[in-house]
């Protein structure tokens, strides 16, 4: 650690350059300063992203991989610093900057939503899991008719452009369909989602959008769902959704209707069984639906509701008259 | 007979309270669930709320916090408590009884909220 | 709360026509539907419940189909005394979502 009375003078570091290396992607790269005397001191770089969402933190290497938005710019400061139990010495910053793409605004897509769903692969001897990818949007405000949208997404190193694609009435693409994918349907990587355009008219703005995968992956409904009746025990059973979660990971939501006086029970489990004492001679409609668990992931969609299956009695008579 | 008959309904002021009584015959009330239902002059119907067997209400949420459904098995009864009356709610008030549908409805008692 | 909407809100026919009425619902009620008549002055008589099954006492020719949230009823060959008003009305879930009644189809002569 410094000495209180040591003087020392940080130097901003140089050549600081910001390089797209993906989509959605950014490294920053920078060098000490050559005049910087090192003195045997511990230097330290604070980085700061600007835009398009502020941020900052502090890295010993002169490098930082960045996962951001593009299509608004790119802004990011870094400066030198030292620091020990209760001071803090810093360089003046060196910045650099990615411009916003041509094209008005206007021209991108708006409201992207992506989900992605996982099956089973059937192709595979060992049980494995392949998801695929849906993704929507709206064409822009601005865009000329003769428009045409192109999709990629990132997950991790893997980059991959739409093949198949959805087209509104001018023949312009608006929906996107992978049914295989590189995406790893327990990974924490964020999944990066971009979508161009051309026109002989004008530039297209890109529009590039980051998902955590928690958030869009919709859950298959639990498979062979079972109902069935014994005396007031109504006995319900199922079975794990297709999943690369194992079956500890999920929460259940079991739905019973009675479907004679409109009463609905919903109730919340972590078992695949659950038995309700009824207390009429009714049909009873029952459904479930599962959501991957806290334990295994962050709180993400529910899947739908099960195919609804009947049981009990459904004769439209009075139950007990005088 | 199987029927239900309401009563109670009249001319009443606003910001006054009223209880409606519905009254089965010809079936055991503890039996079903039941519901009540209005109609303003000239209107559509409208859901009020619902009691069941096990004495548990519910309410449309315009209904809630001044609207209250009870039963009485042994008197075969439900009522309607009608409390901080409007205008808005003179219509004729039904009761019915539930069973995949609204299967008996009574004739209907109208409420007049009026100065 | 669910919201029903029925159309046409009235509907002018002669007799042996056939009639239809749809109702949509604003969230899925899977077969969870009634459809009442109401003649003026009178109250409402049940039709149909479950969507598409016959309460006692009910002509063949009312007939009801559909589920989820579109659903319809139809009138085959229509008679004098059918001339009234329908309703359809939600029966899911009703301690979480209410039983709405559609806002009523009058069905005239034409």
């Known amino acids: 650690d410094l000495l209180p009375d040591e003087k020392i003078s940080l130097l901003p570091p140089v050549n600081f350059t910001i390089k797209v290396t993906g989509l959605a992607q950014v490294l920053l790269q920078w060098k000490p300063n050559p005049d910087q005397e090192q003195r045997n001191v511990n230097l330290e770089y604070q980085v700061k992203i600007n835009a398009p969402k502020e941020d900052d933190y502090e890295t010993r290497i002169t490098e930082s991989k960045c996962v951001t938005i593009l299509h608004k710019g790119f802004s990011a400061s870094v400066r030198t610093i030292l620091q020990n139990d209760h001071s803090l010495l810093a360089s003046s910053w060196a910045s650099a900057e990615l411009h916003a793409p041509p094209g008005s605004p206007g021209t991108s897509i708006v409201n992207l939503t992506c989900t992605t769903n996982t099956t089973e692969d059937n192709y595979s001897r060992l049980r494995s899991y392949q998801v695929s990818l849906h993704c929507t949007w709206l064409v822009g405000t601005d865009a000329p008719e003769d428009t045409q949208y192109f999709l990629y997404y990132r997950y991790g190193s893997w980059t991959e452009e739409c093949q198949e694609y959805s087209k509104d009435t001018l023949g312009r693409n608006i929906a996107c369909w992978f049914p295989r994918t590189f995406i790893l349907s327990k990974g924490r990587d964020w999944l990066a989602v971009l979508v161009n355009g051309s026109s002989k008219h004008s530039a297209i703005r890109p529009f590039d959008q980051l998902f955590a995968l928690h958030a869009i992956d919709q859950i298959n409904p639990p498979l062979n769902v079972t109902a069935e009746i014994e005396g007031t025990r109504l006995s319900i059973q199922w079975e794990k959704p297709v999943s690369a979660f194992p079956i500890h990971c999920f929460d259940y939501e079991v739905k019973i209707h009675n479907t004679r006086n409109g009463y609905l029970q919903i109730e919340k489990l972590m078992t695949n069984a659950f038995i309700s004492i009824i207390d009429d001679l009714s049909k009873y409609d029952v459904q479930v639906r599962a959501a991957v668990s806290s334990m295994c992931r962050e709180a993400g969609l529910w899947s739908e509701w099960s195919q609804p299956i009947y049981v009990g009695n459904d004769e439209h008579k009075p139950l007990r008259e005088w | 007979e199987v029927q239900l008959v309401e009563s109670g309904g009249g001319l009443v002021q606003p910001g006054g309270s009223l209880r409606l009584s519905c009254a089965a015959s010809g079936f055991s009330l503890s039996s079903y669930d039941m519901t009540w239902v209005r109609q303003a002059p000239g209107k559509g119907l409208e859901w009020i709320g619902i009691?069941?067997?096990?004495?548990?209400?519910y309410y449309a949420s315009w209904a809630k916090g001044r609207f209250t459904i009870s039963r009485d098995n042994s008197k075969n009864t439900v009522y309607l408590q009608m409390n901080s009356l409007r205008a808005e709610d003179t219509a004729v008030y039904y009761c019915?009884?539930?069973?995949?549908?609204?299967?008996?409805w009574g004739q209907g008692t109208l409420v007049t909220v009026s100065s | 709360d669910i919201q029903m909407t029925q159309s046409p809100s009235s509907l002018s026919a002669s007799v042996g026509d056939r009639v239809t009425i749809t109702c949509q619902a604003s969230?899925?009620?899977?077969?969870?539907l009634a459809w009442y008549q109401q003649k003026p002055g009178k109250a409402p008589k049940l039709l149909i419940y479950r969507a598409s099954t016959l309460a006692s006492g009910v002509p063949s020719r009312f007939s009801g189909s559909g589920s989820g949230t579109d659903f319809t009823l139809t009138i085959s060959s229509l008679q004098p005394e059918d001339f009234a008003t329908y309703y359809c009305q939600s029966n899911y879930g009703i301690n979480y979502y209410g039983a709405a009644f559609g806002q009523g189809t009058k069905l005239t002569v034409l």
């Open positions: 969230q899925n009620i899977y077969s969870n």
């Open positions: 009691i069941y067997v096990s004495g548990s209400a």
């Open positions: 019915a009884r539930i069973n995949y549908g609204l299967d008996l």
